[in-house]
């Protein structure tokens, strides 16, 4: 994990109000009772900061110890700081919990850059602004780490929401969400609305502002506009999906669709950027450069290193293209597309130039481990992780940042043939050789 890249995002003040709307008629297939409607107690339960992650408040132990926990759909361990660390304001103190049980087993998680290690146990866990339940869950008590916690990020642990297959030390360690569903009547589904501010926030603004919502067990109508479109979860490990086509300003990249999913495509709230396989990244950047050719930017900008600044309020959004990803639909030979704006893929950066400037980093980057639809994508959409039906839904987020000319979009259906051929089949290897890092 390279936190500057792998951990998400700016939170913040979205454009549209987040107040609840009345449920309305849609053309979607009917859902079973209890899965839809109003989840007022969970709306606005996320906070965060640019590039540093969205977090939810959780309590652990008896009596309850309150911690802020990073919401990460790209991993499967519930792990919390459990020893003093210079970047932690607080940490889980197992000795103070009467309900803590030691599993007498260690866990070690190395990343591309950095690592954490700790001791496994179980304890009682609840989410104050979530379902009114308490569950006994596995907890990795982090005793040692390197380049994992982020100074000033305000979170003390990580909630891995993906599947057991990628849990550490192995798939026998039940992830938190599996425990929640097994032990309660919470439906096997959660949804995320991550709200990018569109401008950098300082620490006090982050604490006072909305970062978004994690709706556990359902879908809240107030958080999206238009219809939800679903793509199948290809395999239950990461939240793996299949991209069948990519367009820049409506121009097809015209690559073999296998390239878009080489070696996988995942939806990951724990990654800041939209990360693309090398060949796809190079083609996409070439196309974005061509579309924005009235202005030129240094190579370091396209590499996500240098910042580009404009006088406050003069960012030329119009010269940058929209990016559309077509995802496999639920119906044979049918796809739909999600479209993001430069307001999503140019990430506001704070504290670098004067207050008279708006500065940005290019938040699309190269990957050697497949496509990662990180916060750059998720900030445009309300994303439903429908585990029960093995599918992920996308709708336009009510809080996405846009301008008067363009908006993020979810549109379909489109006819796309041979979509199954777009998936890449990873050669089976010994699990111990799998790469943990998502840098």
């Amino acid at each position: 994990t390279q936190h500057g890249i792998r951990l998400p995002l700016r939170s913040g003040l979205g454009g549209a109000p987040l107040g609840l709307r009345l449920p309305r008629e849609t053309d979607e297939e009917p859902e079973e009772p209890g899965r839809r409607g109003s989840f007022v107690e969970m709306v606005d339960n996320l906070r965060g900061k640019s590039g540093q992650g969205y977090y939810v408040e959780m309590t652990v132990g008896s009596p309850p110890q309150t911690l802020n926990i990073l919401v990460d759909t790209g991993s499967s361990n519930f792990a919390v700081g459990a020893a003093p660390h210079p970047f932690l304001h607080r940490y889980y103190q197992r000795q103070l919990s009467s309900t803590y049980r030691d599993l007498r087993k260690g866990v070690y998680v190395p990343y591309t850059q950095g690592k954490w290690e700790g001791e496994l146990g179980t304890d009682l866990v609840s989410i104050p602004h979530g379902p009114n339940v308490t569950v006994r869950a596995n907890i990795a008590a982090i005793t040692e780490s390197d380049k994992f916690f982020i100074n000033g990020s305000n979170w003390e642990g990580i909630l891995g929401l993906a599947y057991a297959e990628i849990a550490r030390p192995d798939d026998s360690l039940e992830p938190f969400f599996d425990s929640l569903v097994k032990q309660t009547h919470v439906p096997n589904l959660f949804s995320l609305q991550l709200c990018g501010a569109g401008f950098p926030l300082n620490q006090s603004e982050v604490l006072a502002s909305v970062g978004g919502s994690m709706i556990i067990g359902g879908i809240d109508h107030s958080l999206y506009t238009g219809s939800l479109w679903y793509t199948p979860i290809r395999r239950e490990w990461y939240y793996e999906v299949i991209i069948v086509r990519v367009e820049i300003n409506g121009q097809d990249l015209k690559m073999d669709c296998k390239e878009y999913n080489y070696d996988k495509s995942i939806v990951d709230s724990g990654t800041t950027n939209l990360r693309l396989p090398k060949k796809v990244f190079e083609a996409a950047v070439k196309s974005i450069k061509a579309a924005s050719s009235t202005e030129k930017f240094p190579d370091g900008f396209w590499l996500g290193e240098q910042l580009v600044c404009w006088q406050a309020g003069t960012t030329p959004w119009n010269i940058f293209p929209v990016i559309s990803l077509y995802l496999m639909g639920e119906v044979t030979n049918q796809s739909f597309r999600i479209t993001i704006l430069p307001q999503q893929y140019l990430r506001p950066v704070e504290d670098v130039a004067t207050s008279q400037d708006d500065c940005y980093k290019f938040a699309i980057s190269q990957s050697s481990t497949g496509t990662v639809m990180g916060a750059v994508i998720m900030e445009g959409f309300y994303v439903v992780f429908d585990r029960a039906r093995k599918r992920i839904g996308f709708a336009v987020s009510a809080c996405h940042v846009h301008d008067e000319f363009r908006t993020a979009a979810v549109e379909g259906p489109f006819v796309t043939l041979d979509m199954e051929d777009c998936g890449y089949n990873i050669p089976q290897t010994d699990e111990s050789t799998l790469m943990t890092g998502r840098a």
């Epitope: 370091g300 290193e305 910042l307 580009v308 670098v352």
Partner: antibody
């Protein structure tokens, strides 16, 4: 080889507009590999970036000068120009035009500079 | 705003001596830093770009190092023509705008 040459009045009255032109010779101002820049240096002091222009006309200005600065390009004459309005004695400086090269990052070629004095 | 602080303000050395000039950024600029030389009555000349790459035609006695916030320009053995003012400039924030205050290298 490419050369840059500044030209314009050496004396400007307070409250008036300073106008300078930079002529590019030995190459085309329309090369896509470069921005063209103005930088100034008050007597005995350090360097201050004023702004850049691309041959397409796209401009970037120093926020502290933005309200008074206009940079324009004339590709037919292979020239780019600086206008700085409402000048005061604090605008007295040697004004340099420069090429922003090395991937649009570094001022790799400079004119010799021209001293502009603001005085009545 | 990123501020570049150069030290010392003045460096008094003799020809043949080694000169070490420092440039410190108020926050990381990665390796996006340049060094310029300016002689009296002349325009600045690019010496080093990307912290350590010599520009075309610059003698090997000039070298740059550093990344992040701390950078150094070294002149291994001063020649008479090297006595001048040296400026650093960051381009981490683009367009390039911030220069250091300069270090004057004078004959002792």
């Amino acid at each position: 080889q490419l050369q840059l040459q500044e030209s314009g009045p050496g004396l400007v009255k307070p409250s008036e507009t300073l106008s300078l032109t930079c002529t590019v010779s030995g190459g085309s101002i329309s090369w896509s590999s470069y921005y063209w820049s103005w930088i100034r240096q008050p007597p005995g002091k350090g360097l201050e970036w004023i702004g850049n222009i691309y041959y397409s006309g796209s401009t970037y200005y120093n926020p502290s000068l933005k309200s008074r600065v206009t940079i324009s390009v004339d590709t037919s004459k292979n020239q780019f120009s600086l206008k700085l309005s409402s000048v005061t004695a604090a605008d007295t400086a040697v004004y340099y035009c420069a090429r922003l090269g090395h991937g649009y990052n570094y001022f790799d070629l400079w004119g010799r500079g021209t001293l502009v004095t603001v005085s009545s | 705003e990123i501020v570049l602080t150069q030290s010392p303000a003045t460096l008094s050395l003799s020809p043949g001596e080694r000169a070490t000039l420092s440039c410190r950024a108020s926050q990381s600029v990665s390796s996006y830093l340049a060094w310029f030389q300016q002689k009296p009555g002349q325009a600045p000349r690019l010496l080093i770009y990307d912290a350590s790459n010599r520009a075309t035609g610059i003698p090997a006695r000039f070298s740059g190092s550093g990344s992040g916030t701390d950078f150094t320009l070294t002149i291994s053995s001063l020649e008479p023509e090297d006595f001048a003012v040296y400026y650093c400039q960051q381009v981490y924030v683009w367009p390039p705008r911030t220069f250091g205050g300069g270090t004057k290298v004078e004959i002792k």
